[in-house]
């Protein structure tokens, strides 16, 4: 999946002038102005050029312009560690004018027994140790401080928390004579939050806990605990929210069942079942109470844990997620897809769509991909004409307005965006797919034929000729 797709921009129209909001009252910290994109979806590039020039005129002496990097801080409490006992940490880029804090949890699968953790340690050590972490990282996508790359929250305080606990951010066990590895994912989050309070988080208005892949599942597992932690520490006014990207997995039946020998081929339920025991994993209290002892693994699956959460969570999930397909033993490697597999893949999209029907804030494009929010071109994909940054902006507004009794969605500002077309890449704004063997970009028609879809069969239920359907797909209608 990684690096396999390029992103393309669609044609855009010129924008009307942007709307501004009233200035803050005297003595209030200056907040980044929320941008209302209602009228400017058409030509984001031109609008962003205006915003950038405005932003730069507002910060003539600011280091913001000069330095895009987040700086590494290893935890002061060195008992909170990565797998190998080295201190965990976080990368931070402060934005002193802002009361928004974005904490991003990195992803990277997991390991669930001594053998596959040993192998992970010897091949992917940066995911188990802080010993070789770079001093700085560049923020990309939702972690970017450039308004054109991150129209949603470019001016927030940005925190990237590297994943070095291999436990889907759930573990609470330290390294000992008995345990070769520490699994402290849940404790790392708590300690990062505690240390950030001394670095300005105490004055936050909103804390958005975001994450991709295993980090996305980590959001679902930890968002309520973070809210509870801040309340207990005397900061009940900080609104805690979650943004879970590519971490909403299904405990479905694998396409081909294989024994649980490694992380990739092990069925997700079995991997998590084994993992929880190995990591001493903790799950949200309200979810845990819904399941018997030994059944806590259920809480790692979004559709089961989500209804138990108190904090608002926005779910971002590709309908045909590559990590989901991997654990389901579906490997698309360039051979045309047989009908049984094609139906399995279509059904996966249908099942996923069904699990999101009661998730009011969701963005689920019908694409074959994995992760989105820290990709530089995360703004490019649209569902029903709305981009993800725009949907997140609408979500912010809906939460801001939620003290009003009305539960109706804001007019022209949707937050429930789930593609309804039934096959991979039926959404023309999907990331471009490359043929895995030739490296060539494939258009939608080539991709669908490669996937074994007969254009006649696809077009018929829509009441279209195959040529008409292809035209529509190519034009993005």
């Amino acid at each position: 999946s990684e690096g396999r797709k390029t992103w393309r921009r669609r044609g855009q129209q010129p924008p009307p002038p942007p709307r501004t909001e009233a200035a803050p009252a005297a003595g209030q910290p200056v907040e980044s102005f929320p941008l209302d994109f209602t009228a400017v979806e058409g030509n984001m590039d031109s609008f962003m050029a205006q915003v950038k020039s405005l932003a730069q005129s507002l910060y003539p002496c600011s280091a913001q312009q000069l330095n895009e990097d987040l700086r590494l801080h290893l935890l002061l409490d060195t008992s909170v560690t990565c797998n190998d006992g080295s201190p965990a940490g976080y990368y931070l880029k402060e934005s002193r004018g802002s009361r928004r804090w974005l904490l991003f949890l990195e992803g990277g699968w997991y390991c669930f027994n001594r053998e596959n953790c040993d192998s992970r340690y010897d091949t992917m050590r940066r995911l188990m140790s802080s010993r070789d972490w770079p001093r700085t990282r560049t923020g990309t996508g939702i972690l970017s401080s450039q308004p054109e790359e991150n129209p949603y929250w470019w001016n927030a305080n940005m925190v990237f928390i590297p994943y070095c606990s291999s436990d889907v951010w759930s573990g609470a066990s330290s390294k000992s004579e008995k345990n070769e590895y520490a699994f402290m994912g849940a404790l790392i989050i708590q300690e990062v939050v505690r240390e950030l309070l001394g670095r300005g988080l105490s004055g936050a208005k909103v804390l958005l806990l975001a994450g991709s892949s295993a980090g996305g599942t980590g959001v679902l597992l930890n968002v309520d605990r973070v809210a509870e932690q801040l309340e207990k520490l005397g900061y009940p006014a900080i609104q805690v929210r979650g943004l879970a990207d590519s971490g909403w997995f299904l405990d479905n039946k694998q396409y081909r069942h294989t024994d649980c020998v490694d992380t990739i081929t092990c069925a997700p339920t079995e991997a998590i079942r084994r993992g929880i025991r190995y990591w001493n994993g903790v799950v949200p209290e309200r979810c845990r109470r819904q399941f018997q002892e030994g059944e806590e693994w259920n809480c790692f699956f979004g559709y089961k844990v989500y209804p138990t959460l108190r904090c608002p969570v926005f779910v971002v999930q590709w309908l045909f997620d590559e990590a989901q397909l991997t654990v389901d033993n579906v490997h698309l490697t360039g051979q045309p897809v047989q009908e049984g597999l094609r139906l399995y893949i279509q059904n996966l999209g249908r099942e996923l769509r069904h699990t999101l029907k009661d998730v009011p804030a969701s963005f689920a494009p019908a694409c074959l991909s994995h992760e989105i929010i820290i990709r530089s071109h995360w703004t490019d994909v649209q569902v029903k004409g709305t981009s993800l940054p725009r949907a997140l902006h609408c979500w912010d507004r809906s939460l801001h307005d939620s003290h009003k009794a009305s539960k109706t969605p804001l007019k022209g500002c949707p937050v429930h965006l789930v593609d309804s077309c039934p096959w991979p890449h039926c959404n023309p704004s999907c990331p471009t797919v490359r043929d895995q063997f030739t490296g060539q970009e494939m258009n939608v028609a080539q991709f669908l034929m490669h996937m074994g879809f007969d254009m006649q069969t696809v077009a018929q239920p829509q009441g279209l000729e195959p040529s008409e359907l292809l035209g529509m797909l190519s034009n993005g209608s």
């Epitope: 999946s1 990684e2 040993d118 340690y121 992917m124 990739i264 490997h331």
Partner: antibody
Framework: DVQLLESGGGLVQPGGSRKLSCAAS????????MHWVRQAPEKGLEWVAY????????YYADTVKGRLTLSRDNSKNTLFLEMTSLRSEDTAMYYC????????????WGQGTSLTVSS | DIVLTQSPASLAVSLGQRATISCRAS??????????IHWYQQKPGQPPKLLIY???DLESGVPARFSGSGSGAAFTLNIHPVEEEDAATYYC?????????FGSGTKLEIK
């Protein structure tokens, strides 16, 4: 200077046993996963076995499972490969290789030791 | 196990021209932003030498005429311009999961 030096090869009869060694120097041996790779005459490379950095996990290719035992002595910076029930198809050059821990690629190879299984 | 299929088995390239070797995996070897495919060069009587790691990173000391690309399950090694000393056998190798495996090799001859 990082170095790996294999020894213990030679001529062995079918059904016999042999213990190969790999002496490491110039790096912290206990920090790295170590592997054996072999190459039959005029053939390609075949991955044989892996020992984790701590020595707690070993993994073998199916072709050698049950006949090979991999071990390491981190205090002596040495990797061992004990081979039993040897067959003619085990005839090969045996290389010991260090796996980088930021990707598992073999960034350092020994010169190899040649094993011939023949009567 | 992940099977690596290398092609062609051999190729002859004129001095100064481009050599392209392909390596296909039976399933994706990419995860968490990295592709776990590596390329080695082996000359007769010598151990293999690392050229490219993680699909596209050039090992230090290796000439810039060697380059690697690809992700997912499809990878390519390019040599351009080919020099006399590049005559050797080239192997791809994956380290995505155990057991590791190698491709069958491509023998490059300089015309």
């Amino acid at each position: 200077d990082v170095q790996l030096l294999e020894s213990g090869g030679g001529l062995v009869q079918p059904g016999g046993s042999r213990k190969l060694s790999c002496a490491a120097s110039g790096f912290t041996f206990s920090d790295f996963g170590m592997h054996w790779v072999r190459q039959a005459p005029e053939k390609g490379l075949e991955w044989v076995a892996y020992s984790s950095s701590g020595g707690t996990t070993v993994y073998y290719a199916d072709t050698v499972k049950g006949r090979l035992t991999l071990s390491r002595d981190n205090s002596k910076n040495t990797l061992f490969l004990e081979m039993t029930s040897l067959r003619s198809e085990d005839t090969a050059m045996y290389y010991c290789a260090r796996a980088s821990y930021d990707g598992g690629y073999f960034d350092c190879w020994g010169q190899g030791t040649s094993l011939t299984v023949s009567s | 196990d992940i099977v690596l299929t290398q092609s062609p088995a051999s190729l002859a390239v004129s001095l100064g021209q481009r050599a392209t070797i392909s390596c296909r995996a039976s399933k994706s070897v990419s995860t968490s932003g990295y592709s776990y495919i590596h390329w080695y060069q082996q000359k007769p009587g010598q151990p293999p030498k690392l050229l490219i790691y993680l699909a596209s990173d050039l090992e230090s000391g290796v000439p810039a005429r060697f380059s690697g690309s690809g992700s997912g399950a499809a990878f390519t090694l390019n040599i351009h311009p080919v020099e006399e000393e590049d005559a050797a056998t080239y192997y791809c190798h994956h380290s995505r999961e155990l057991p590791f495996t190698f491709g069958s090799g491509t023998k490059l001859e300089i015309k």
